[in-house]
């Protein structure tokens, strides 16, 4: 439950008051003003968009809204020099060539700057020759076809279908191998659900529809030319050439008709098994190179796109804390989209919009919160995280310092069947907490909580009578201050059925057709989901802001350090042999996770008992609990990724989306088995135990007694 | 076999209405979308509107979409136009047609129906 | 509106001639193109789909091509039946409009 609050100026002034002004028919009328045009980052469009956002903020009572702008490396098709994919014949004569942009969606037709699909910040190219299909483009795909099938990719161009991971690493890993060029599909078998048709008459991606995004591998980094610092006018810039996570071969994403048209013709090997295969009509061979009567054709890229330094714009809004102002809980997600963005970012911003607009209307009325509130709409998300991470950047002093939590808020569907959460440990008891309190949306939970209908579908797989929450990855804007500063951070947003629906990420993601219209009519018409996200999203803001302790629990993270900790160990006792040539022991993490429980119980009941209306003790308290994550943080950061600095979660170096826990360790680990110097290997698992174990029992440390 | 069968056309007054019909056999209607096309005598050929699998989406030419009203019937397999404000310009063959999806080109099509609009 | 530009009008070829009719968009519409025969009295039939695939039924002397904004129809060794009127379509985009044809005489 909510505390009562000296801050409030009647007891109305409650989290009940601000759920119940938050409105869905507001959030709809939010979302149709938000996707209408394009809000390309970098476009004239997001700057208008930026500005009403200020003014609308401004309208809603904050106490103030800022727009901060960066100078960042963006990329963009040439208008006048399409970006396609040929097949060429023997003469060097095009056969045939891949679609230019997509078929507009239907009442669309006359709409302007719809950006054509493209690779953002692929290289300029025009490599040409054999194709080789590479299932996912994953670590293991080029295990399986290295290793097992001896297919050797250098010099070839690689076709890999989108899904699984994030798509900077499938390039990555081509680029690893030797290939030449890649080209990205969405096959069927990921991004057309059986029974279900296709836009605009269902959920589902038609053969013309291609997904945009970014091939980078910034590992954190921000804007490519200024790692580490904010790209601000005085700041030095990198050369292209050391630019940070810039790829080197040339990349385009195609839809699954012309995809057919590519695959069609392959030849060489059959593809290993059954995994390998989507839903096309083709055989899936790999390759390299066409069949038999097709031999002679080839594939050639055209890639004309271009990287400029180009203005972007956050928007910052603030509503000071009456008690702790220099205290600050962040609600941050992207205005920045491909396209219209019905989903990605806008089902979000238009949450945002609503919560600011519940919050304004309680401090209209006299309320403030305890803390601080920042409210960000982030620019650049599409193109690496870019406004998030220099604006946090540019205020790292301050955040380190300040930041009590940051909740993020890009789309808040991708699905209509659960809630999806993915937070700090020391957050599982206050999302826990607030579900109970909120009703669920879904068909057959009338009138029961939301904790109720999230555990029955989402189950944890460790505790029964709980539901799942997830690591936090990446690929989002809570990157920078999760990763890189220590701030405890969460997300939200409804979910789909994982059990039935098999496909990555939801099937017009980034495509074209991500309309208000596929909200409307699709996913969420009554837009009761979203209300959902907004109080779950909203609550948490709330609660983080307002209560006199903060919703904290550090017994949880002890419990996950326990679990990471077996993880990794069982991982390693793979290789019980090794372990034993170079004395490798975990006995140290096993110890500091237990040191680390035992101090988090006794600060658990030290936290229970202690006087908290003297405000000394109870500032002294919080800043144990804010300042717990920060502990987690390596100033050194993760090997060859520096700005990956928490010792306990990093965004997997195979999948960013994907959280790794312990992922030095991990790293270390992984294929140890091929590595040529196994002293060497086994010397870093060692080297990353010891890191590991530090950090646990510094963090224990900030929990123990002060004095 | 694939069958499209348009009501009678016929003669009508300027400014009046008219309601075509157009019944399907021979597949399953309710997998395609339905679509009626015109012509007039002796010229090219003219999309007027079409409808999407279930009838929530219907699509029109702009300058007919104030005055025709495409519908189905997917329990009669009927396909349906209504014509309001009729003006001697109207005047042409109408065929209904059928197509796969949105994006998508017309596999079927009736034998055509004339209708004249003139005093 | 994407427009659609079809020549010649009209075309007279002897029976065993081949003939090819083109058709021009007024923007880029990839393959999204369909070919059409209609005999005097008659309803259109489907020819081609995807500016180069061949309806069931539709003899291997009509063949497509073209991509992006320029298209063609070909008809090798012209036969009796193959004479009447041709209109290509679009269906890139609403509204999905026709050529304004063209019709194939006997000489």
């Known amino acids: 439950k909510s505390s009562s609050e000296a801050t409030n100026i009647t007891p109305k002034h409650n989290m009940k008051a601000f759920l119940d002004e938050l409105k869905a028919e507001n959030i709809k009328k939010f979302l149709h003003n938000f996707t209408q045009i394009p809000h390309l980052a970098g476009t004239e469009q997001n700057f208008q968009l930026a500005k009403q956002i200020q003014s609308q903020w401004k309208e809603f009572g904050l106490d103030s809204v800022e727009l901060t702008h960066y100078d960042v490396l963006l990329s963009y098709p040439n208008k006048t020099h399409p970006n396609y994919i040929s097949i060429i014949n023997e003469d060097g004569n095009e056969i045939f060539n891949t679609s230019l942009f997509e078929p507009p969606p239907a009442g669309y037709e006359n709409v302007s700057d719809i950006v054509p699909p493209f690779s953002a910040f692929s290289p300029q190219g025009m490599p040409e020759g054999d194709l080789v299909y590479v299932n996912y483009a994953r670590t293991e795909d080029f295990f399986k076809l290295e290793r097992d099938m001896k297919i050797n990719c250098s010099g070839k161009i690689v076709i890999a279908r989108y899904g699984k991971v994030f798509r900077g690493n499938k390039v990555k890993n081509a680029q690893l191998a030797g290939a030449t060029g890649v080209i990205l599909y969405s096959d069927p078998a990921d991004y057309f659900a059986p029974g279900v048709k296709s836009y605009p008459d269902g959920w589902n991606l038609p053969g013309g529809g291609v997904q945009r995004g970014n091939i980078l591998n910034l590992n954190g980094a921000g804007d490519p030319l200024t790692p580490g610092y904010p790209a601000n006018e005085y700041a030095y810039r990198r050369g292209i050439a050391e630019a940070v996570g810039l790829p080197s071969i040339p990349v385009h994403p195609i839809g699954y008709y012309d995809a057919q048209k590519l695959l069609e013709k392959m030849g060489g090997s059959a593809s290993p098994d059954s995994s390998w295969r989507g839903s096309l009509k083709v055989p899936y061979n790999v390759g390299p190179g066409f069949t038999g009567n097709f031999s002679t054709q080839k594939v050639k890229m055209h890639i004309h796109s271009t990287s400029e330094v180009t203005r972007i714009y956050n928007v910052i809004g603030t509503l000071r804390g009456a008690v702790e102002p220099d205290r600050y809980v962040i609600l941050g997600g992207h205005r920045d989209s491909w396209v219209f963005g019905g989903i990605d970012p806008q089902s979000g911003a238009a949450v945002v919009h609503e919560i600011v607009r519940s919050f304004g209307t309680l401090k209209k009325e006299g309320w403030r919160p305890r803390r601080t509130i920042l409210f960000a709409s982030w620019d650049a998300e599409e193109f690496g995280l870019l406004g998030s991470t220099e604006w946090a950047e540019e205020n790292s002093r301050l955040l380190q310092e300040r930041g009590v939590a940051y909740i993020n808020a890009d789309s808040s569907i991708e699905g209509n069947y659960t809630l999806r959460v993915d937070c700090t440990p020391l957050m599982y008891s206050l999302v826990y907490n607030l579900t109970k309190e909120l009703e669920s949306p879904d068909e057959g939970f009338e009138g029961k909580s939301l904790y109720e209908s999230w555990t029955k579908k989402s189950p944890s797989p460790e505790f029964s009578g709980m539901p799942r929450i997830s690591k936090l990855g990446s690929g989002n804007d809570f990157e920078v201050f999760f990763q890189r500063l220590g701030i405890a951070s969460g997300r939200a947003r409804y979910t789909k059925n994982w059990e039935t629906n098999k496909f990555s990420s939801y099937p017009l993601y980034h495509s074209v057709y991500e309309t208000y219209e596929l909200v409307e009519k699709f996913y969420d018409p009554m837009f009761k989901y979203h209300l959902t996200v907004a109080q779950v999203r909203g609550g948490m803001v709330f609660e983080l802001a307002n209560s006199v302790v903060l919703p904290f629990d550090c017994r949880d993270y002890a419990v996950v350090l326990r679990k990471y900790a077996d993880k990794i160990y069982n991982i390693s006792m793979k290789h019980p042999q090794e372990m034993k040539t170079y004395s490798v022991s975990f006995d140290s993490l096993f110890s500091a996770v237990k040191n680390f429980t035992e101090i988090a119980s006794k600060f658990s009941e030290r936290l229970r008992d202690f006087d908290k209306s003297n405000p000394i003790l109870l500032r002294m308290m919080n800043d144990q609990l804010m300042f717990l994550e920060r502990a987690f943080i390596d100033p050194l950061g993760l090997p060859d990724r520096p700005f990956y600095r928490h010792v306990i979660y990093a965004p997997s170096s195979h999948n960013k989306y994907a959280g790794e826990s312990f992922p030095g360790i991990y790293d270390a680990l992984f294929d140890i088995e091929s590595k040529v110097d196994p002293s060497q290997a086994w010397g870093e698992v060692k080297r990353q135990i010891s890191i590991a174990t530090f950090t646990v029992q510094a963090a224990a440390e900030t929990l123990s007694e002060v004095a | 076999e694939v069958k499209l069968v348009e009501s009678e056309g016929g003669l009508v007054q300027p400014g009046s209405s008219k309601k075509l019909s157009c019944t399907a056999s021979g597949f399953t209607f309710s997998d395609y979308y339905m679509a009626w096309v015109r012509q007039v005598p002796e010229k090219g050929l003219e999309w007027v509107a079409s409808i999407n699998y279930d009838g929530s989406s219907t699509y029109y030419l702009d300058s007919l979409k104030s005055r025709f009203i495409i519908s189905r019937d997917n329990a009669k397999n009927n396909l349906y136009l209504q014509m309001n404000s009729l003006k001697s310009e109207d005047t042409a063959t109408y065929y209904c047609?059928?197509?796969?999806?949105?994006?998508?080109?017309?596999?079927?099509w009736g034998q055509g129906t004339l209708v004249t609009v003139s005093a | 509106d994407i427009q659609m530009t079809q020549s010649p009008a009209s075309l007279s070829a002897s029976v065993g001639e081949a003939v090819t009719i083109t058709c021009r968009a007024s923007g880029n519409i990839h393959n999204y193109l369909a070919w059409y025969q209609q005999k005097q009295g008659k309803s259109p039939q489907l020819l081609v789909y995807?500016?180069?695939t061949l309806a069931d039924g539709v003899p291997s002397r009509f063949s497509g091509s073209g991509s992006g904004t320029q298209f063609s129809l070909k008809i090798n060794s012209l036969r009796p039946e193959d004479f009447g009127s041709y209109y290509c379509?679009?269906?890139?985009?609403?509204?999905?409009?026709f050529g304004g044809g063209t019709k194939l005489e006997i000489k």
């Open positions: 047609a059928g197509s796969d999806g949105y994006w998508a080109w017309f596999a079927y």
């Open positions: 995807n500016a180069e």
């Open positions: 379509q679009h269906f890139w985009s609403t509204p999905p409009t």
